[in-house]
């Protein structure tokens, strides 16, 4: 593109040229695309609501939880067992949780009247020992409860396990109660209370709604909406027993979906609760399954501090606010219309390659041959035609070349390297159609020559007999017009052309040869339709004819405006336009390209 | 699970060697701490020496300067070079393992026969003239 470009290159607007086919089954598969696209887009904006502006939910939980629960204890009290009744209320069985959690104990095992002394470690295959060699003073085990002293004393009766430095006793590694102490915790109920905000929209609201009834419990189909959860039936909803999980613990995910349409015409905004297992209930033993932490209540005894440890199993109740509130913007109907626009054109993409597909080679030689259904098919080759325009590179080594005796042109795309044009194969292409309409700007002696005296007034073709060979002509030639080329060694091969393949009679013998290329009558005819007021001396006259000449005879012969630009003449046409048209001196300058 | 088998026992003269193979079964061998233990008729069960997972070695005071033990992943084996036998070795040698998968056993605790989980049947060596 040239880099400078003046005012008048601004205000101009390109379009494509298009090319209609008529024809009934691509129009179907056009309106089938069309259709199909147009359903889908509109159900997608509808469905989807993608007509909205959507923003997430910014939320906050508080939540309540209510029951009470009867524990039926067994405790060791002077070396006898004994059965302890006690009921745990709220206090006793929920813990301050930071975000949307809540915790409620369902199991524990207590370690009663622990203070800080030297005592022996509780029996587990890293403890035992047999000597001191088997502890290490200042040893700390991530899984130790206390600081090894470095001695192995008796535990209990031949036990020997490693003393330490810690709350003792040491806690017994024991398995949770069976069933789970607090099994009625199943029983409890949660009310939760959401309240929700979406500034972008300028617009809030809560789970509980005035006149809500607070006696209710949550059913997923009868109740919905009551904000109030009893713990058994939300292990309910996702597959799991109460009772199981009470004994290792858990963690439970409730999860609450705002799913707002806050366009006033169709204005919805209600949560969808629904809950989900949160941990990993197929976790072996050693990596330590359920949910449990440790706490401890601290006392004094006899002026000595001491604490009852804890260890909590309980399920942790996650609450999870998720969710979006859509209102209708017309920038994001425009950005969704702009965005779906694309897909009308797979008609197109899906159309063009149908007829890229079976106009291929391949349909032409191995299938349309062999199948008589596809024959229809056939139709998709004149489609091509006219909707492809194919170019060929113009590199310096293009050249057309066009046999009298061959319906084809050859193009030769390739250095000759010393080989006659006339010599080399090249590839074979489709001869233009000839348009008739450019014969009409001929000269009217041109379409009604009188009859040439002893010539019959049917079409004549090239006579038959080849014309003898004259001495001088080149191996090469076939028709015996040729001459020897007057270029340098290096250029020669390229003037090395017959106008017929097989030996036959010359194309400058034709009758049409003689009126359209070297008539000057037409010639000059064809020089003043371009330039109108062209006045030339005899030499400079004769030039114009000349190149005017070989133009006629590169158009005749290659039809293409394209094809003729790279033509190459036959010998015996260029030096029969030669000696119609001769140069006063100097030599022939042969063919340049015009690229 | 892993099975441990011994081999390699039997009859041989005082000063003169032996070399006792344990093949474990199962993929996870390399993650073992692998240890030998004997017991004579009568007696307790007596260390004599461990690998760790992790290549470190410790050996039964007893044994220290003659045998050595070692270990081959690809072979899921350990073995117990044993050189300058004496009467006193005479024993059922068992060949143990200890998982270390979830923490390395610490150096001081590869002697402790409650360290292992898992247990050969025993070879017997007799060192005798």
């Known amino acids: 593109m040239p880099a400078c470009c003046s005012c008048s290159d601004v205000f101009q607007y390109e379009t494509n040229k298009v090319t209609r086919i008529q024809s009934m089954n691509y129009g179907t598969i056009k309106w089938f695309f069309h259709v199909i696209i147009f359903s889908y887009v509109c159900f997608a904006l509808v469905s989807d609501k993608l007509y909205q502006r959507k923003e997430p939910v910014i939320s906050s939980v508080h939540t309540k939880v209510k029951g009470i629960a009867e524990v039926k204890e067994e405790i060791v009290e002077n070396g006898v067992k004994k059965l302890v009744h006690s009921v745990f209320d709220t206090a006793d069985y929920t813990f301050p949780l930071q975000g949307n959690s809540f915790f409620v104990m369902t199991n524990f095992l207590k370690t009663e009247g622990q203070e800080q002394r030297l005592c022996p470690e509780y029996p587990t295959r890293r403890t035992l020992c047999s000597s001191d060699r088997g502890c290490k003073k200042g040893w700390m085990d991530p899984q130790s409860k206390g600081i090894q002293t470095g001695r192995c004393v008796v535990y209990e009766g031949n036990q020997k396990t490693c003393e330490v430095s810690a709350w003792c006793p040491i806690e017994a590694v024991e398995e949770a109660p069976r069933p789970a102490l607090l099994n009625s915790a199943e029983n409890f109920t949660v009310l939760i209370k959401n309240n929700i905000d979406f500034p972008g929209h300028n617009y809030t609201t809560r789970n509980i709604l005035p006149g809500l009834n607070i006696t209710c419990t949550f059913h997923k189909t009868q109740n919905p909406q009551c904000p109030i959860f009893r713990l058994g039936d939300i292990f309910r909803e996702t597959g799991d027993n109460f009772s199981d999980v009470a004994i290792q613990g858990g963690i439970m995910g409730i999860e609450i979906y705002w799913d707002c349409n806050l366009d006033r015409w169709f204005h919805h905004c209600r949560p969808k609760y629904s809950f989900r297992r949160l941990d990993d209930k197929t976790t072996n033993v050693s990596l330590y399954p359920g949910y449990n932490f440790r706490y401890a209540k601290y006392y004094k005894e006899n002026n000595v501090e001491k604490r009852t440890l804890i260890k909590v199993f309980g399920i942790r109740f996650d609450i999870l606010v998720f969710g979006t509130g859509g209102k209708f913007d017309i920038i994001q109907l425009v950005v969704y219309i702009g965005s779906t626009l694309s897909y009308f054109g797979l008609a197109a993409v899906f159309i063009d390659f149908l007829i890229d597909t079976y106009s291929s080679n391949c349909c032409r030689s191995h299938i349309y041959p062999w199948c008589k259904c596809c024959q229809p098919c056939v139709v998709n080759e004149y489609y091509y035609r006219k909707k492809c325009e194919s170019i060929v590179e113009p590199k310096p080594t293009l050249k057309y070349v066009s046999f009298v005796d061959e319906s084809h042109i050859r193009m030769v795309n390739q250095q000759l390297l010393g080989r006659s044009l006339q010599d080399v194969k090249g590839q074979e292409v489709p001869r233009p159609a000839m348009d008739f309409t450019d014969l009409s700007r001929l000269p009217l002696a041109l379409h009604d020559t009188p009859p040439i005296p002893g010539q019959p007034e049917e079409i004549q073709l090239l006579r038959k007999e080849a014309t003898p060979r004259s001495r001088d002509s080149p191996v090469w030639c076939q028709c015996g017009s040729c001459l020897p080329s007057q270029l340098p060694e290096s250029h020669r091969c390229l003037e090395e052309l017959c106008c017929r393949k097989k030996p036959g009679a010359c194309i400058t013998t034709s009758e049409l040869f003689r009126k359209l290329v070297l008539s000057r009558h037409v010639l000059q005819f064809l020089l003043l339709y371009q330039e109108p007021l062209l006045a030339l001396d005899v030499d400079s006259t004769n030039s114009r004819l000349r190149h005017c000449a070989y133009r006629c005879y590169a158009t005749w012969r290659f039809g293409s405006q394209d094809m003729a630009d790279f033509a190459i003449l036959p010998s015996c046409c260029r030096w029969r336009i030669r000696k119609e048209f001769p140069k006063s001196e100097g030599q022939y300058s042969g063919f340049k390209s015009p690229y | 699970e892993v099975q441990l088998v011994e081999s390699g026992g039997g009859l041989v003269q005082p000063g003169g060697s032996l070399r006792l193979s344990c093949a474990a079964s199962?993929?996870?061998?390399?993650?073992?701490?692998m240890g030998w233990f004997r017991q004579a008729p009568g007696k307790e069960r007596e260390f004599v020496a461990a690998?760790?997972?992790?290549?470190?070695?410790d050996y039964g005071d007893s044994v220290k300067g003659r045998f050595t033990i070692s270990r081959d992943n690809s072979k899921n084996t350990v073995y117990l070079q044993m050189n300058s036998l004496r009467p006193e070795d005479t024993a059922v040698y068992y060949c143990?393992?200890?998982?270390?998968?979830?923490?390395?056993?610490?150096?001081?605790?590869?002697?402790?026969?409650?360290?292992?989980?898992?247990w050969g049947q025993g070879t017997l060596v007799t060192v005798s003239s």
């Open positions: 143990a393992a200890a998982d270390e998968t979830l923490g390395a056993v610490p150096n001081f605790r590869l002697h402790e026969k409650y360290e292992y989980e898992y």
């Open positions: 199962g993929r996870t061998f390399r993650h073992y701490a």
């Open positions: 690998i760790s997972s992790y290549g470190s070695t």
